[in-house]
C-alpha cells in the first residue's frame, strides 16, 4: 500500500504562437481543478477504462477573472497535492491521465457548470520511494507542469511497496496463514496483494500482481463469465474445485446482482445496475471511495472521502448510471427537429437535417420561399417549414392573388368613413379628429395631438399615413 502524489506547478499558455484565450471572463469568472487517473502498466488504454490504480480530484483553485486585453497568464492553482492511495503493490510502470477542469461561476441554472479544458496522458516508469519526477505536458495551446512520486505507507517498503511487515499480534505466533517476516523475526508478514482490480469474488492470486480466475470466469480481472455450464474440472490449490451457478430459465433468475443491485437481461447474459457504493459485474465490490476512481467515462467523483460516506458521480454528456457506466441512447430523446436524422457519435450528437433545415438540431428553417412567388408585389416570409406571403395593400390570400377590400377591417377610428383607393385606403374623419386613420383628436385651442415628426421631416411638412 502507498500513495501516488501529484503536484501541479503551473497551467497556462504553452510557448509559441497561438496563445489560448483565457478560460474565464469578467462575465463568467471561473476556477480550475484537476483530476488524475492512474492505470497499471504501459498499455494504451481508452480514456474511459477504469482508473484501476486509483483516481483523485483536487480542491477548487482561487476564483479567476480575466483582465480585459491581457494575455492568458498561468492560471491560479488549487493548493496542495493530489494524492491517489493504492492498496495493492505499486506496479512500477503506469499510465496517467491528468484533466484540467473549469468550473464556471456565472449565473448557471442548477449550480456551477463544469467543462473539460485540457487532458494530458502519458506512460511512465517509476519506482516507489524515489525522488520527485518532473514533467511537462502540452494539450493544444495549453501547457501543464507537474511533479509526481510514489511512496509507500508504513509498514510497506520497497520499490513496489510489497515488503509488508507489521508487528506480531502475539509474541509466539503471527496468526493463521501469516509467517514471521524475515529478517525481522519480531514482525509478521501481511497478506498478499493481487493485480489492481482483480475481482474479489471470481479472481485470486498467489503472487503479487497476478489475477487468476476461478472456474467459469475469464478476463484480465476475472470479471467476464465464460459460460453458465462450466462445472467441470478441479482447479486451485489442494484439489479444491469451484462452485457453479446452475442456470435457470433466465439469466436474472435468483437475481445474481448482490447488495441490492437490480438485474436486467441482455442478449447474451445479464447486467446489474448497482446502488451507489457498489460496483463490479454483480455489484459485489464495496467500500468504494472517490480515491478508488469509481466514476467511469470521464465522470467526476464528488464526496465519498471514506467508505462510509456516499460518493456521487457527475456524468459527462452521453453517460448515466451511478458510476457513469451506461451509455445513454441520446437519440431516443429525439433531439433532431423537423424530421432530422439523429446520429450518436459517442463524443457528440449530430443531426442530419432534411432539405430546407439547418442548425445543430435542424431547428433553423433555411428557405421556405425558394421557388414560391407571392403575386401582386407581395413578399415571402419564411417560417415553420411553410412559406407565408405578406401582401401589398389591396391584396390578400395565401399567395396574394385575391383582391382585398382594404376597408373590411374598419381601419378608420372615431367614426371616420373608409374609401377604397387605388393606392390603399382613405379615411374621411368625423369632426374633431384627424390623421390617416382619424386617430388624433384636434384640441379645442386648435393644436393637434400629432406625434413628433419622424426623422427627416420638419413639423408642418405634409405627412401621409397609409
Amino acid at each position: 500500500a502507498g500513495v501516488f502524489e501529484l503536484q501541479i506547478h503551473s497551467f497556462g499558455p504553452g510557448p509559441g504562437p497561438g496563445a489560448p484565450r483565457s478560460p474565464c471572463s469578467a462575465r463568467l469568472p471561473c476556477r480550475l481543478f484537476f483530476r488524475v487517473c492512474l492505470k497499471p502498466g504501459l498499455s494504451e488504454e481508452a480514456a474511459e477504462s477504469p482508473c484501476a490504480l486509483g483516481a483523485a480530484l483536487s480542491a477548487r483553485g482561487p476564483v479567476y477573472t480575466e483582465q480585459p486585453g491581457a494575455p492568458a497568464p498561468d492560471l491560479p492553482l488549487p493548493d496542495g497535492l493530489l494524492q491517489v492511495p493504492f492498496r495493492d503493490a505499486w506496479p512500477g510502470t503506469f499510465s496517467f491521465i491528468i484533466e484540467t477542469w473549469r468550473e464556471e461561476l456565472g449565473d448557471q441554472i442548477g449550480g456551477p457548470a463544469w467543462s473539460l479544458l485540457a487532458r494530458v496522458a502519458g506512460r511512465r516508469r517509476l519506482a516507489a520511494g524515489g525522488p520527485w519526477a518532473r514533467d511537462i505536458q502540452r494539450a493544444g495551446a495549453w501547457e501543464l507542469r507537474f511533479s509526481y512520486r510514489a511512496r509507500c505507507e508504513p509498514p510497506a517498503v520497497g520499490t513496489a511497496c510489497t515488503r509488508l511487515c507489521r508487528p506480531r499480534s502475539a509474541p509466539s505466533r503471527c496468526g493463521p496463514g501469516l509467517r514471521p517476516c524475515a529478517p525481522l523475526e519480531d514482525e509478521c508478514e501481511a497478506p498478499l496483494v493481487c493485480r489492481a482490480g482483480c475481482s474479489p469474488e471470481h479472481g485470486f492470486c498467489e503472487q503479487p500482481g497476478e489475477c487468476r480466475c476461478l472456474e467459469g470466469w475469464t478476463g484480465p480481472l476475472c470479471t467476464v463469465p465464460v459460460s453458465t455450464s462450466s462445472c467441470l474440472s478441479p482447479r486451485g490449490p489442494s484439489s479444491a474445485t469451484t462452485g457453479c451457478l446452475v442456470p435457470g430459465p433466465g439469466p436474472c433468475d435468483g437475481n445474481p446482482c448482490a447488495n441490492g443491485g437490480s438485474c436486467s437481461e441482455t442478449p447474451r447474459s445479464f447486467e446489474c445496475t448497482c446502488p451507489r457504493g457498489f460496483y463490479g459485474l454483480r455489484c459485489e465490490v464495496s467500500g468504494v471511495t472517490c480515491a478508488d476512481g469509481p466514476c467511469f467515462n470521464g465522470g467526476l467523483c464528488v464526496g465519498g472521502a471514506d467508505p462510509d460516506s456516499a460518493y456521487i458521480c457527475h456524468c459527462p454528456p452521453g453517460f448515466q448510471g451511478s458510476n457513469c457506466e451506461k451509455r445513454v441512447d441520446r437519440c431516443s430523446l429525439q433531439p433532431c427537429r423537423n424530421g432530422g436524422l439523429c446520429l450518436d457519435l459517442g463524443h457528440a450528437l449530430r443531426c442530419r437535417c432534411r432539405a430546407g433545415f439547418a442548425g445543430p438540431r435542424c431547428e433553423h428553417d433555411l428557405d421556405d420561399c425558394a421557388g414560391r412567388a407571392c403575386a401582386n408585389g407581395g413578399t415571402c416570409v419564411e417560417g415553420g417549414g411553410a412559406h407565408r406571403c405578406s401582401c401589398a395593400l389591396g391584396f390578400g390570400g395565401r399567395d396574394c392573388r385575391e383582391r382585398a377590400d382594404p376597408c373590411a377591417a374598419r381601419p378608420c377610428a372615431h367614426g371616420g368613413r373608409c374609401y377604397a383607393h387605388f393606392s390603399g385606403l382613405v379615411c374621411a374623419c368625423a369632426p374633431g379628429y384627424m390623421g390617416a386613420r382619424c386617430e388624433f383628436p384636434v384640441h379645442p385651442d386648435g393644436a393637434s395631438a400629432l406625434p413628433a415628426a419622424p426623422p427627416g421631416l420638419r413639423p408642418g411638412d405634409p405627412q401621409r399615413y397609409l
Partner: nanobody
Amino acid sequence: EVQLVESGGGLVQPGGSLRLSCKSPTYTISSGYMGWFRQAPGKEREGVAAIYIGGSTTLYADSVKGRFTISRDNSKNTLYLQMNSLRAEDTAVYYCAAQLRPNSAYHPLDGRKYNYWGQGTLVTVSS
C-alpha cells in the same frame, strides 16, 4: 474487533448429519468471502467450503463435495455448514473464517485469505 463464534459440533455416528453455525455478534459482514476450515489431529489445516457474501459463489473441497453445503443467513448474520453422510475422516476441529474487506489475495479455500478466525468446534465421527 470482529469475533466469530462457532457452535454445533459434537459426536455423531458415521452416516449421520450435523449443522455447524458461525455467528459474528459484533460485526455485520456484508461482503467478502467466509469459509469453513478443519484441522484433524496431526494434519495440516484444510479448506472445506467457502461462500462469497453479497454474491453467488460457493466452493467446496473435493473430499466433501455433494455431502456438505455452505450457506449464510444474512438476517441472522450467521454462516452455516450442513454436513451429511459424515465419515470417520471428517473428524476434526472446524473453524469459521472471514475477510473483513473483500480482496482477491489467495484462493478462497486457502487459509491465508482470511484475517478473522473463530476458536473452533470439535466434530467427532465415530461409532
